[in-house]
């Protein structure tokens, strides 16, 4: 029995006609099974295969090879969270966090907790002590005075 065009199988009860549109992107094998075009997958070959490495959790695509990030995620593979806007010396594990690096504090990690180490403000051999975020105190050697032992 020879089947009509696009019909396959015993009894010619399987239909497959190649298509490349909203409904699917496929060719047909000799048995009438849909064979997805490169970059497509799923039962109807209408699901795009995203860029290799694209985060399955935070990235997606509607076109093969693409990787579109969910809100709050960024990077080529959508695997990097976006920190809180204005976060200076901080990182995130989840979107909009601002987890401060060592020696930084405050909501935006913009307060220096180690002003002495970062700026070394005390002159003329003065000893620096961190007294709070962005705050310090110099203990001046004999003969020197002023906030930074500059006098």
């Amino acid at each position: 029995v020879t089947c009509d065009d696009y019909y396959y199988g015993f009894g010619c009860n399987k239909f497959c006609r190649p298509r490349d549109d909203f409904f699917g992107h496929y060719a047909c094998d000799q048995n009438g099974n849909k064979t997805c075009m490169e970059g497509w997958m799923g039962p109807e070959c209408n699901r795009a295969i995203c860029r290799q490495g694209c985060s399955p959790k935070h990235g997606s695509c509607k076109l093969p090879g693409d990787c579109r990030c969910q809100y709050g995620w960024q990077g080529l593979y959508c695997d990097k969270c976006i920190p809180h806007p204005g976060c200076v010396h901080g990182i995130c594990n989840e979107p909009w966090q601002c987890l401060c690096e060592t020696n930084w504090g405050g909501q935006l990690c913009d307060k220096d907790l180690n002003y002495c180490g970062t700026h070394q403000p005390c002159l003329n051999g003065g000893t620096c002590s961190n007294t709070g975020p962005d705050k310090y105190q110099c203990s001046c050697p004999e003969g020197y005075s002023g906030p930074n032992c500059e006098i």
Epitope: Y6, Y7, F15, R17, F22, F23, G24, N46, R47, K62
Partner: antibody
Framework: QVQLVQSGAEVKKPGASVKVSCKAS????????IHWVRQAPGQGLEWMGI????????KYAQKFQGRVTMTVDTSTSTAYMELSSLRSEDTAVYYC?????????WGQGTLVTVSS | DIQMTQSPSSLSASVGDRVTITCRTS??????LTWYQQKPGKAPKLLVY???ILAAGVPSRFSGSGSGTDFTLTISSLQPEDFATYYC?????????FGGGTKLEIK
Amino acid sequence: QVQLVQSGAEVKKPGASVKVSCKASGYTFTDYAIHWVRQAPGQGLEWMGIINTYYGDSKYAQKFQGRVTMTVDTSTSTAYMELSSLRSEDTAVYYCARGYDGFAYWGQGTLVTVSS
Amino acid sequence: DIQMTQSPSSLSASVGDRVTITCRTSENIYSYLTWYQQKPGKAPKLLVYNAKILAAGVPSRFSGSGSGTDFTLTISSLQPEDFATYYCQHHYDIPWTFGGGTKLEIK
């Protein structure tokens, strides 16, 4: 087994909106598109549109463009059809249906009555 | 949009009769055609898809044929439960329009 269960009958005033739900079970929801079809009393079947349940992309019949919105909630395997600016001619049974090569599965239908 | 012309719009026949319903499309739709049966107050039931493939559980007295623009649904020997309304629908491109329906009544 595959089932599509729709929300109950609605009575709406002209100008209002209606949102009909269609809860799917018995298969992987995102593997198949959902279509919406309506049937006015004593009339034939009218195709309204299709939604790709994986991406949420939808395509509508020109007649309903601008008035219909089809959405899905994949977490509950539910499709929704919202029709706005209702008029008396929108009184119909609204069906959801599943498929690519024709509709093997249909919801039981939701009667929407538009009356002042 | 593809127009679907279904004929006849109504038909009277007797049990045991052979019945043919036709559907013509305004452009080539290959074999992207479906036939449904609908009874009052019920959702349509899929009978034939891709023009000639019988849906699961549908009796073999139903058959579909045609491709391109001309399609036929045939019931070889009418049974009492076959009296209903029949619709064709294309699924070639958007929108998936339906034919106007054929009401099959008992003579």
